[in-house]
């Protein structure tokens, strides 16, 4: 049921597409051989207890992830695409979304953004997501209406709380994350701030409170004094490595 789903994420996920949509059934699992390593932006990720998030496009992944077929020979994956960790600067890339926030893909390499690489008035195909229609959606109708629209994006960088489609729409130090009704520019997390350790276990919940990633030199770890809380409600915070 809707009221028992996981709805916060550090991985900045979009809601699953409606049943039968491009992304398949919500929560559909992808079979990946345990122990396979994927090259991430900051580390190699082992998939021993990591269930990949299936995707059809970059927008279905987190701001620090991109959508791609695993390239490292994971058995059983077939042609399915999953969300992979973004690539740090100086790593190889094929498109902007592969690079971690604050970087873009230039000549096949992730480079630091100076925001000048976006032509002013560039026309982009953008995914606009609305939770519900012009009036409150009926209970249980929590999937976004996904409509593709050609919009003129002038790349004046969004300030904290302003609407966005992706992190590149936001000013430095901010990422684009879902905040209940909409996606807005939120601050990258500082030490001690609550983060979300995204486990990807079982079916994927409707994640409508998304958080940015922890800032440089920080990792999302369980808060030491919260061990008494139940597993489901334990807080994670950004802590020094």
């Amino acid at each position: 049921t809707l009221n028992s789903v996981l709805i916060n994420s550090n991985a900045i996920k979009n809601l699953p597409p409606p049943l039968g949509g491009a992304g398949g059934q919500p929560g559909s699992a992808v079979s990946v051989a345990p122990g396979v390593l994927y090259e991430g932006g900051n580390k190699y990720q082992t998939l021993d207890n990591y269930q990949p998030y299936p995707c059809a496009e970059d927008e279905e992944c987190g701001s620090d992830e991109y959508c791609s077929s695993p390239s490292r020979g994971a058995a059983g994956v077939g042609g399915v695409q999953i969300c992979l960790a973004c690539r740090k600067r100086r790593k190889r890339c094929m498109r902007h979304a592969m690079c971690c926030p604050g970087n873009y893909c230039k000549n096949g390499i992730c480079m630091p953004s100076d925001h000048s690489h976006f032509p002013r008035g560039e026309i982009e195909e953008s995914i606009i997501e609305n939770l519900g229609n012009d009036h409150n959606a009926a209970a249980g109708d929590g999937y976004p209406r996904r409509t593709t629209l050609t919009s003129k994006i002038y790349h004046t960088k969004g300030q904290e709380g302003s609407v966005c489609l992706r992190s590149s729409d936001c000013a430095a130090g901010l990422c684009c994350a879902r905040h209940f009704w909409s996606k807005i520019c939120k601050p990258v997390l500082k030490e001690g701030q609550v983060c979300t350790k995204h486990k990807r276990k079982g079916s994927h919940g409707l994640e409508i409170f998304q958080r940015c990633y922890c800032g440089e030199g920080l990792a999302c770890r369980i808060q030491k004094d919260h061990h008494q809380a139940s597993n489901s409600s334990r807080l994670h915070t950004c802590q020094r490595h």
């Epitope: 009221n3 028992s4 606009i128 209970a139 009704w181 909409s182 609550v194 409170f209 139940s230 489901s232």
Partner: antibody, heavy 116, light 112 residues
């Protein structure tokens, strides 16, 4: 700095209508969702409605659904709340609030009194 | 419906620390770790003090802090000052009704 100024409140009879306005300045109005929140005299805060930055989505509290309509004019930096079929229990101070990361900026409110 | 329960009133002396609680259920506060806090002085508009459990907007004193354990969120004010006397509201969202929800409010009295 961010400023939100409500107007349009007043005394109205039960069953009557009123239209509230909220003039916004000091930020890019068209980039933010906006809300109305009300507070009955001596009571707590009650969320009323929200509208997306481009007016494509609106949501309402059950207590006002079908009677109130939220709208906005981005060219005028103005938020509106059309209130129809007003009831005594709608008597409250109505606040216009910017919904950035939660309700991060509020106006000073306008009082709506529904009484015969 | 989601209901957030707050104590009607709390009090403390200047310099002390006080904590205001906000209790939900496992399907709201306990399930998704999201709550904000607002301060409202009499006759004034509310002001956002804490968002996303423990984040302070710029301009808010670091005497204000938020935390959460299980189904209960808490606002702690340390080094209590006379100007902290106000009503405090917690707030979260109802994912079924797609609405915002406020707690009933807590009146903070600073003694002496």
């Amino acid at each position: 700095q961010v400023q939100l100024v409500e107007s349009g409140g007043g005394l109205v009879q039960p069953g009557g209508s009123l239209r509230l306005s909220c003039a916004a300045s000091g930020f890019t109005f068209s980039s933010y969702w906006m809300s109305w929140v009300r507070q009955a005299p001596g009571k707590g805060l009650e969320w009323v409605s929200v509208i997306s930055s481009d007016s494509s989505s609106t949501y309402y509290a059950d207590s006002v659904k079908g009677r109130f309509t939220i709208s906005r004019d981005n060219s005028k930096n103005t938020l509106y709340l059309q209130m129809n079929s007003l009831r005594a229990e709608d008597t409250a101070v109505y606040y216009c609030a910017r919904h950035g990361i939660d309700f991060d900026h509020w106006g000073q409110g306008t009082l709506v009194t529904v009484s015969s | 419906d989601i209901a957030l329960t707050q104590p009607a009133s709390v009090s403390g002396s200047p310099g002390q620390s006080i904590t205001i609680s906000c209790t939900g259920t496992s399907s709201d506060l306990g399930g998704y770790n999201y709550v904000s806090w607002y301060q409202q002085h009499p006759g004034k508009a509310p002001k956002l003090m804490i968002y996303d459990v423990n984040n302070r907007p710029s301009g808010v004193s670091n005497r204000f802090s938020g935390s959460k354990s299980g189904n209960t969120a808490s606002l702690t004010i340390s080094g209590l000052q006379a100007e902290d006397e106000a009503d405090y509201y917690c707030q979260t969202y109802d994912q079924i009704k797609l609405s915002a929800v406020f707690g009933g409010g807590t009146k903070l009295t600073v003694l002496g």
